[in-house]
Interface confidence: medium
């Protein structure tokens, strides 16, 4: 396993929520992506391929997510100051080999302007 800081913008803010972008190589066909807040698993998504190249997407800890051919986006809503923390994308690659695990992280700063329900 390797841990590191993301060299891309992981956090995209909109409408009082945040999209957390977890990237993976476009060559990857089967993987598990977990979103961690500190050491706690918030969300996960697993993509596998069966016979006949049928794709299966499963989540044990479901969050609103969006899958593309090179990223998984997890969406957190109703932001408040308690959301400020280190977030990590925990990627396990099953195919193509070799099996790899990598933790890519960044700190989510919460500013007043990004909160969903500001007091006027």
């Amino acid at each position: 396993e390797i841990n590191g800081s993301a060299n891309y913008e992981m956090f995209i803010f909109h409408n009082g929520g945040v999209q957390i972008l977890c990237k993976y190589p476009d060559i990857v066909q089967q993987f598990k992506m977990q979103l961690l807040k500190g050491g706690q698993i918030l969300c996960d998504l697993t993509k596998t391929k069966g016979s006949g190249n049928t794709v299966s997407i499963k989540s044990l800890k479901f969050c609103h997510s969006q899958l593309s051919n090179n990223s998984v986006s997890f969406f957190l809503y109703n932001l408040d100051h308690s959301h400020a923390n280190y977030y990590f994308c925990n990627l396990s690659i099953f195919d193509p080999p070799p099996f790899k695990v990598t933790l890519t992280g960044g700190y989510l700063h919460i500013y007043e302007s990004q909160l969903c329900c500001q007091l006027k």
Epitope: I2, G4, N7, Y8, P25, N70, T104
Partner: antibody
């Protein structure tokens, strides 16, 4: 589909210059290290240079150091090789190729081989 | 620089028969992460090189399973279990452990 297309080659006199370009499509160009590899007529492959996804890390083969400059424009999905002070031994087909996947700061951890190559552009150095 | 040495340099083959190419490196290609940073490429006549095997033994996408890579450290082998006519071309090994990347001299595979 994933594709790399080189251009900019041609016939140039010794001491002259050229700028090679490589247009990438079908993948997130800004996530990958990119390489230039060349092949002299009837010879084997020779690695020339590579550049990290952000352009902050660059390496050159000793044979081209100080004469060649690799660069990239992620907004244009393009890779470049500026070649100066050309010599007869620089005559070759120049290929651009996709290298390390790079999303971790200072750690080209994801390596699946040099898995995408362009068709090549020919540089001929002759007086 | 790491020197890569291939043998043989020329390999006449019979379709349907197995074939084997050796690649030796002047230094170990085994990274601390446990992977051997050794690739195999095939350049068919008039074409760009194409990736066959990466990290010593992993077949690239779309590569037929008659191709296999093995070895560790400094000694590596590319095997073709049953050669087909379309397998002719020049095979190169390349080390990706250190810069500069270095290639073997190439092995020309041709039909007998």
């Amino acid at each position: 589909q994933v594709q790399l297309v080189e251009s900019g080659g041609g016939l140039v006199k010794p001491g002259g210059s050229l700028r090679l370009s490589c247009a990438a499509s079908g993948f997130t160009f800004s996530d990958y290290y990119m390489s230039w590899i060349r092949q002299a007529p009837g010879k084997g492959l020779e690695w020339v240079s590579y550049i990290s996804s952000s352009g902050s890390t660059i390496y050159y083969a000793d044979s081209v150091k100080g004469r060649f400059t690799i660069s990239r424009d992620n907004a244009k999905n393009s890779l470049y090789l500026q070649i100066n002070s050309l010599r007869a031994e620089d005559t070759a087909v120049y290929y651009c190729a996709r290298d390390f996947y790079d999303i971790l700061t200072d750690s080209p951890y994801f390596y699946y081989g040099v898995d995408v190559w362009g068709q090549g552009t020919t540089v001929t150095v002759s007086s | 620089d790491i020197v890569m040495t291939q043998s043989p340099l020329s390999l006449p083959v019979t379709p349907g028969e197995p074939a084997s190419i050796s690649c030796r490196s002047s230094q170990s290609l085994l990274h601390s992460n446990g992977y051997n940073y050794l690739d195999w490429y095939l350049q068919k006549p008039g074409q760009s090189p194409q990736l066959l095997i990466y990290l010593g033994s992993n077949r690239a996408s779309g590569v037929p399973d008659r191709f296999s890579g093995s070895g560790s450290g400094t000694d590596f082998t590319l095997k073709i279990s049953r050669v087909e006519a379309e397998d002719v071309g020049v095979y190169y090994c390349m080390q990706a452990l250190q810069t500069p990347r270095t290639f073997g001299q190439g092995t020309k595979v041709e039909i007998k």
